[in-house]
């Protein structure tokens, strides 16, 4: 059946996929093109209640922090 990820398994998957970047449970503010404040879609809605692929998981990774110049 569809690959769903919930609870601790979802957290493990996010931690693994996102590595040191960390992750959000909701998409970061400003994600996408909509200006109106629609209800935020979260990773639980997308991956626990529906099938979830790696690219969708990656959308919830935090951006890489820029390295400081010497």
């Amino acid at each position: 059946g569809p690959e769903t990820l919930c609870g601790a398994e979802l957290v493990d998957a996010l931690q693994f996929v996102c590595g040191p970047r960390g992750f959000y449970f909701n998409k970061p503010t400003g994600y996408g093109s909509s200006i109106r404040r629609a209800p935020q879609t979260g990773i639980v809605d997308e991956c626990c209640f529906r099938s979830c692929d790696l690219r969708r998981l990656e959308m919830y990774c935090a951006p890489l922090k820029p390295t400081k110049a010497a």
Epitope: P2, L5, D12, A13, F16, C18, G19, R21, D53, L54
Partner: antibody, heavy 123, light 107 residues
Framework: QLQLQESGPGLVKPSETLSLTCTVS??????????WGWIRQPPGKGLAWIGG???????YYNPSLRSRVTMSVDTSKNQFSLKLSSVTAADTAVYYC???????????????WGRGTLVTVSS | DIQMTQSPSSVSASVGDRVTITCRAS??????LAWYQQRPGKAPKLLIY???SLQSGVPSRFSGSGSGTDFTLTISSLQPEDFATYYC?????????FGPGTKVDIK
């Protein structure tokens, strides 16, 4: 160039814990784009993914083995390890360690493999 | 889990032949598919990734195509070193899964 080498006992008794180590040479295990995985292949059969680990220590295991698998990484030794508990004859296989490219490359394939080590579970 | 199937399970061919192997996923995986070659007693070797991208150092006689659920590996002119078993792998979702393999042997 980067090379991977598995090591560990070739014979494990039923109900005991299988322990393997993969040594990474010719490069650092700490590279941010590299993930590290274990795949096994029972004699004469196909390949099965066991799980993977990132240098930070975060892991993801195949749900079919999750209750028995533990992976760890030792960045100071450039090694990562696999432990599989409560083994049975069904765990007899060639065990491979492999490099997997992750998020920064946008794909999740195994582009570099160790030679593999045969582990037999028998009393 | 996403189940991967391959056909045929084995194929007998001669040097110079064109060989085609198919891989099917139990549900759509976009183009997140790889092909590996495994010679007897050796580790698998990555040939193709993202369904059609040739891995560095792999001869151009190997090519891949497909998306969604159906994929193909083609060897345009079989060479002696190509007699091996070929596996597909989906990289769309956890857990990563492989096909059962297709053995290419000498006719």
């Amino acid at each position: 160039q980067l090379q991977l080498q598995e090591s560990g006992p070739g014979l494990v008794k039923p109900s005991e814990t299988l322990s393997l180590t993969c040594t990474v040479s010719g490069g650092s295990i700490n590279s941010s784009s590299n993930y590290w995985g274990w795949i096994r292949q029972p004699p004469g059969k196909g390949l099965a993914w066991i799980g993977g680990i990132y240098y930070s220590g975060s892991t993801y295991y195949n749900p079919s083995l999750r209750s028995r698998v533990t992976m760890s990484v030792d960045t100071s030794k450039n090694q990562f390890s696999l432990k599989l508990s409560s083994v049975t004859a069904a765990d007899t296989a060639v065990y491979y360690c492999a490099r997997q490219r992750g998020h920064s490359s946008g794909w999740w394939y195994f582009d570099l493999w160790g030679r593999g080590t045969l582990v037999t579970v028998s009393s | 889990d996403i189940q991967m199937t391959q056909s045929p399970s084995s194929v007998s061919a001669s040097v110079g032949d064109r060989v085609t192997i198919t891989c099917r996923a139990s549900r759509g995986i976009s183009s997140w598919l790889a092909w590996y070659q495994q010679r007897p007693g050796k580790a698998p070797k990555l040939l193709i990734y993202t369904a059609s991208s040739l891995q560095s150092g792999v001869p151009s006689r190997f090519s891949g195509s497909g998306s969604g659920t159906d994929f193909t590996l083609t060897i345009s002119s079989l060479q002696p070193e190509d007699f091996a078993t070929y596996y597909c792998q989906q990289a769309n979702s956890f857990p990563f899964t492989f096909g059962p393999g297709t053995k290419v042997d000498i006719k």
